[in-house]
């Protein structure tokens, strides 16, 4: 995936609800720093739905690819109001950006 293209997608579609930087504040959605390798519903200090907490998967490229295509299908009961990204290449770009930005 292309990190720069992914950053644009993040700004357009995700940044209104999420921050990515270390120590970034929770908004409508949780801060995403340290996302990769973390289980669902475990960002410290954010109140998740039971659906999110109970999903029990680890965030990595494959799980994010599936989730970002259709969040409500992947985690029924999630409070994330986002229809998803149908284009595979766009999801790959967004994931590349998330991988970089959430670990710096």
């Amino acid at each position: 995936g292309d990190v720069e293209k992914g950053k644009k997608i993040f700004v357009q579609k995700c940044a209104q609800c999420h921050t990515v930087e270390k120590g970034g504040k929770h908004k409508t959605g949780p801060n995403l720093h340290g996302l990769f390798g973390r289980k669902t519903g475990q960002a410290p200090g954010f109140t998740y739905t039971d659906a999110n907490k109970n999903k029990g998967i680890t965030w990595k490229e494959e799980t994010l690819m599936e989730y970002l295509e259709n969040p409500k299908k992947y985690i029924p009961g999630t409070k994330m109001i986002f229809a998803g990204i149908k284009k595979k290449t766009e999801r790959e770009d967004l994931i590349a950006y998330l991988k970089k930005a959430t670990n710096e």
Epitope: G34, F36, G37, R38, G56, I57, T58, K60, E61, E62, T63, E66, K99, K100, N103, E104
Partner: antibody
Framework: EVQLQQSGAELVKPGASVKLSCTAS????????MHWVKQRPEKGLEWIGR????????KYDPKFQDKATITADTSSNTAYLQLSSLTSEDTAVYYC??????????WGQGTTLTVSS | DIQMTQSPASLSASVGETVTITCRAS??????LAWYQQKPGKSPQLLVY???TLADGVPSRFSGSGSGTQYSLKINSLQPEDFGSYYC?????????FGGGTKLEIK
Amino acid sequence: EVQLQQSGAELVKPGASVKLSCTASGFNIKDTYMHWVKQRPEKGLEWIGRIDPASGNTKYDPKFQDKATITADTSSNTAYLQLSSLTSEDTAVYYCAGYDYGNFDYWGQGTTLTVSS
Amino acid sequence: DIQMTQSPASLSASVGETVTITCRASGNIHNYLAWYQQKPGKSPQLLVYNAKTLADGVPSRFSGSGSGTQYSLKINSLQPEDFGSYYCQHFWSTPWTFGGGTKLEIK
């Protein structure tokens, strides 16, 4: 207790193929990546590749692309490494490991493969 | 593909000394770096992940640092049980290559 149990030592002839197994207990392999790592005698670690058992998605180091095939059977919680067209260069200890990006990191005890006529 | 260059290849140090092992990536790996310890005849064990986070049960004399392309593992007050080989591995993009290793011998 989390454990990765690898199959026993193998002695095989040049040109043959072999399939090594790695059975997990104490965790579900669908929850992480399963990797295979090669270590030749007195040498360093070489990453062969990984599988995401939940999706079947595999990634390989290009230098092992034509040599190795990684598969997983989620029903038996087992990962496999098949090595083909064996030569003396394939003589090594092969480790399976379960890890992704975090603190979860478990390794098998290693399987010794000897290729000799 | 990202290549990992680890140095030194070997070193000898006394109990109580501080040693530092470095790993240089051929591209930015954005802190996706782990350090492993391996004793002869044993499987590798995770020491550090995400460049600086200590794995569960790892003594605090071990510490990881770095960013971008340059990373290091520091062992303070070396103990006899710290002998063995140390490897870095990056997790940024596949292949997730290892460094060449550092053999640490206790004087």
